[in-house]
Interface confidence: low
């Protein structure tokens, strides 16, 4: 395990005094209730805090909200409740913060039952001022900003109307009725499903998918018999009912729904579901639920068109529709994902992939750790990570795994060491190489966060008792120092730092409780004086990502290229700074067959890297196309794995084949496509 506070640890000198001078307490003049916190913009230092307190009366619930604003990363707060006319804000809608640094904020107010519509408060200057606007409808969802233009908003009403505003919520227009789900696409496009007969629930599987590219002036029906739809990366997915039974199947479009292809995925029955686990512009991870109430399914990874899928992982834990899965994108290293599988004996085990789902393996056992009671062999076992599923099961796991793109290689997670996840109290483990190797970082469950792009890690012990101590490390979790941030312990409720892990400020939230009152309190600690100087060239070292065999010329090659990073030395105590940019040097690898997946009509026999011709089946489902409709498809049998950048080497080109009699999508024939004007 990691060394403690002994001679191996280079302690930060005078850190108590340095931190004491940079610890800021704010007591909120509030009854406890609930609190929500939002950062407004990036690197602005603006934080909005909304506290709400419900007073249940005999006939109705009376609510009180208070709004506070900080512009110095939480060191000081000002009560700005008067800017929203002391109105009770609906916390279920949260604070709708605009994209990028637009400075836009929308708060949705609670209104009395008989009113014609809802009420919102709008700010476009980082919450310095708010404008009250009465709505011509009662909102069902939070206002959704167009990613391209923060003046464009959409919302669904309680009567299933689709409402759009073109002037940041000043004026609203209902562009369609009977709408179930609406989403912004790219280029200010709106996709939505509508029902014709009864309701969203009654018409599930008989919905139509519509598109408007001009904010409701004109519409195009782009799908029928729709169960649901989703957007991921550049892909538009629709789950479509089959003609002859109650199964449904995924269809994919990469041109905003003008043309569709049937995804080569299994169809699912009424009790099953599909879930997009992760998507980018290259590819998609798709979970397909197993029949029956198994709690697991299969992960498939797509090609660059989102059409051809390869089985990636069997028995993938995913409890029910909208339930829990541990699938986690490790953002600190390209190609790495962690998730859980449900083994045959119903134990839960953690798996990791380093090549975007190509191969999965167990996590390596941390050095100097012992296998727990779940292990059959006390010398051979793996690390198993606690994530969403463990949290949902109320295990003693306060936080999901954490990684940040600018803290290269760092992954922090709760875990246990054995043959499967243990229900015993977990410890906190850290990897500094993107999940290849692990070390015990802290004994017992903790809250943790990354500051200054990995230069500092902060942790607080998870306890039912009041706390007043924070732990921090400047060497990626090897050595820890403790700082008592207050004499009076508080009931801890959360750790908050600015998203992006570039800040050096951490806010500790909690409440104090006396005989009569409970008050919200925050402590914001600035670590700038701990990291006294800016990092220089000598503070960084070259690190080859995904390196497993330094002797091998292709060492570090993942998806056709390797990357060398400049990483902060563990022994360097210095500031990366807010403007820190990850320095990486990519180099292209030679192609091997591993850089290609098999195209539609081809497959890889077990333990073989060559793609050979496939029976004329539609993916894996049953309309085997024995006597199916013909489709003209030319292929050489291989397609480059999405995102793979290899060059030279193996070039698996064979003669171009005409594959006929492949099943095609009858999802929406051209004659059914129509355009409508409003």
């Amino acid at each position: 395990s990691a060394p403690g506070e002994d001679e191996e640890c280079g302690r930060v000198r005078d850190f108590v005094a340095k931190l004491a001078n940079n610890t800021h307490q704010h007591v909120f003049d509030d009854l406890r209730g609930s609190v929500s916190l939002s950062w407004v913009g990036d690197s602005t230092g603006v934080i909005l805090v909304l506290t709400t307190f419900h007073v249940p009366l005999v006939i109705m619930t009376f609510g009180q909200s208070k709004l506070y604003r900080s512009e110095d990363y939480g060191k000081n707060f000002k009560d700005i409740t008067d800017l929203i006319n002391n109105t009770f804000i609906r916390t279920e809608f949260g604070m709708a913060i605009g994209p990028e640094n637009s400075g836009k904020v929308v708060l949705t107010a609670e209104v009395s039952g008989g009113s014609r519509g809802g009420r919102i408060f709008r700010s476009s200057d980082f919450a310095k001022n708010f404008v009250q606007t009465d709505l011509p409808f009662h909102p069902l969802t939070q206002m959704m900003y167009s990613p391209q233009n923060s003046d464009y908003l959409l919302a669904l009403s309680t009567e299933n109307g689709l409402w759009v505003s073109k002037n940041f919520g000043g004026k609203w227009e209902e562009i369609h009725k009977a709408v179930c789900l609406a989403k912004w696409g790219s280029d200010n496009t709106i996709f939505f499903t509508t029902y014709a007969n009864g309701s969203c629930k009654a018409d599930l599987g008989a919905l139509e998918l519509w598109r408007t590219s001009d904010l409701g002036k004109s519409f195009k029906t782009i799908g029928v018999k729709i169960y649901s739809f989703g957007l991921g990366g550049r892909f538009l997915f629709a789950s479509v009912m089959a003609d002859k039974d109650t199964t449904r199947r995924i269809h994919v479009s990469t041109d905003q729904g003008d043309t569709w292809s049937m995804a080569q995925l299994p169809s699912v029955g009424q009790e099953q579901f599909y879930s997009i686990l992760a998507a980018n512009d290259d590819m998609v991870f798709m979970h397909v639920d197993e029949p029956g109430d198994t709690g697991f399914g299969t992960i498939f990874t797509s090609d660059d068109r989102g059409i051809v899928y390869s089985k990636s992982l069997d028995r993938h834990l995913y409890t029910t529709t909208g339930g829990e899965t541990d699938f986690t994108n490790v953002t600190s290293l390209r190609g790495v994902y962690i998730t859980s599988v449900l083994s045959e004996d119903n134990s839960i085990q953690t798996m990791i992939t380093f090549d975007q789902g190509g191969r999965w393996t167990h996590l390596r056992k941390p050095e100097n750790s012992e296998c727990d009671a779940t292990a059959k062999n006390k010398n051979e076992c793996s690390l198993h990570i606690h994530a969403s599923y463990s949290i949902s099961q109320k295990l003693n796991v306060p936080m999901a795994p954490l990684s940040e793109p600018n803290a290269v290689g760092i992954v922090i997670a709760h875990g246990s060491v054995g043959d499967a996840i243990s229900v015993m109290v977990p410890d906190v483990y850290i990897s500094d190489d993107g999940g290849y190797s692990w070390t015990k970082m802290l004994e017992g469950p903790h809250y943790y966060t990354i500051l200054d792009s990995g230069g500092i890690i902060v942790a607080i012990e998870h306890s039912s008792r009041p706390i007043n101590v924070i732990k921090f490390s400047t060497d990626e979790g090897q050595c820890w120092q403790t700082y008592t941030f207050t004499r009076d312990p508080i009931y801890f409720t959360g750790l908050a730092s600015e998203p992006g892990a570039r800040s050096m400020n951490i806010s500790i939230w909690g409440f104090t409780e006396s005989f009569l009152t409970a008050q919200w309190v925050s402590y914001t600690i600035d670590f700038k004086d701990i990291l006294e100087r800016n990092c220089e060239e000598k503070d960084y070292t070259i690190w080859l990502a995904h390196s497993t065999d330094p002797e091998d010329y292709e060492d570090g090659c993942i998806l056709g290229y390797k990357e060398q990073f400049l990483r902060l030395r563990k022994s360097s105590v210095c500031q990366n700074g807010r403007d820190y940019v990850v320095t990486k040097q990519p180099s292209i690898c030679l192609c091997s067959l591993e850089d290609f997946l098999c195209d539609f009509g081809y497959y890889r026999p077990e333990n073989d890297s060559k793609c050979v011709e496939q029976p004329e089946l539609k993916g894996h489902d049953l309309e085997f196309c024995l006597y199916g409709r013909e489709e003209h498809l030319t292929t050489n049998g291989y397609r480059k794995i999405p995102g793979d950048k290899c060059q030279g080497g193996v070039n698996p080109v064979r003669e171009v084949k005409d594959l006929k009699k492949k099943c095609t999508s009858n999802f929406l024939s051209p004659e059914k496509q129509n355009s409508k004007s409003n």
């Epitope: 080569q264 029949p291 051809v308 390869s310 049953l622």
Partner: antibody
Framework: QVQLVQSGAEVKKPGASVKVSCKAS????????MSWVRQAPGQGLEWMGI????????SYAQKFQGRVTMTRDTSTSTVYMELSSLRSEDTAVYYC??????????????????????WGQGTTVTVSS | EIVMTQSPATLSVSPGERATLSCRAS??????LAWYQQKPGQAPRLLIY???TRATGIPARFSGSGSGTEFTLTISSLQSEDFAVYYC?????????FGGGTKVEIK
């Protein structure tokens, strides 16, 4: 344990229909496809078709197209094979067999055939005037 | 449809000897091939799937090999319970098809 139990022997007249049942137990019924295979006296095995218990979709061998109907009842974990317009050459033992082809195939990139791993005991159908 | 041809039709072997059964496909079936054993009055039993993988509970004396169009089932040392009819079956292209069978009898 995993079992497929078929209905009893049948004697039919030419032109009639026969419906054979196959009840599955010991595994999740909807997790595997089901094939039907027949064997005429002293002859080899002949594949008739396959059904997906999830949606009930089917695929039949060309030879039986129009005469065979495969159905399933998920509430009782039973599949049925009905053969109509019987003739004397349809006299055979009819087997249902669990066929994991659908579960094994992971889309075009990694299809792998697992074989018909569990068979029913067989149902003898005799067609005679 | 893909035609599966088995040879020989009958194979006479003494107990303890090696038996080699052949199966040929009219076009490539890759490794989507299974072997079954059938004894009189019984249902077939899966021996080999994926051309070379032994099914659960099948003794190690049974092995399968081949890919594409040519496949072999080998019984390294015949036991008395191995005398039966053996069928190969392809599942590469619908309809699934069986070979005509090879009868392994006692010499």
């Amino acid at each position: 344990q995993v079992q497929l139990v078929q209905s009893g022997a049948e004697v039919k007249k030419p032109g009639a229909s026969v419906k054979v049942s196959c009840k599955a137990s010991g595994y999740t019924f909807t997790s595997r496809y089901m094939s039907w295979v027949r064997q005429a006296p002293g002859q080899g095995l002949e594949w008739m078709g396959i059904i997906n218990p999830v949606g009930g979709s089917t695929s039949y061998a060309q030879k039986f197209q129009g005469r065979v109907t495969m159905t399933r009842d998920t509430s009782t974990s039973t599949v049925y094979m009905e053969l109509s317009s019987l003739r004397s050459e349809d006299t055979a033992v009819y087997y249902c067999a669990r066929d994991p082809s659908g579960i094994a195939a992971a889309g075009p990139a990694s299809r792998y055939y697992y074989g018909m791993d569990v068979w029913g005991q067989g149902t003898t159908v005799t067609v005679s005037s | 449809e893909i035609v599966m041809t088995q040879s020989p039709a009958t194979l006479s072997v003494s107990p303890g000897e090696r038996a080699t059964l052949s199966c040929r496909a009219s076009q490539s079936v890759s490794s989507n091939l299974a072997w079954y054993q059938q004894k009189p009055g019984q249902a077939p039993r899966l021996l080999i799937y994926g051309a070379s993988t032994r099914a659960t509970g099948i003794p190690a004396r049974f092995s399968g090999s081949g890919s594409g169009t040519e496949f072999t089932l080998t019984i390294s040392s015949l036991q008395s319970e191995d005398f039966a009819v053996y069928y190969c079956q392809q599942a590469r292209l619908g309809p699934w098809t069986f070979g005509g069978g090879t009868k392994v009898e006692i010499k």
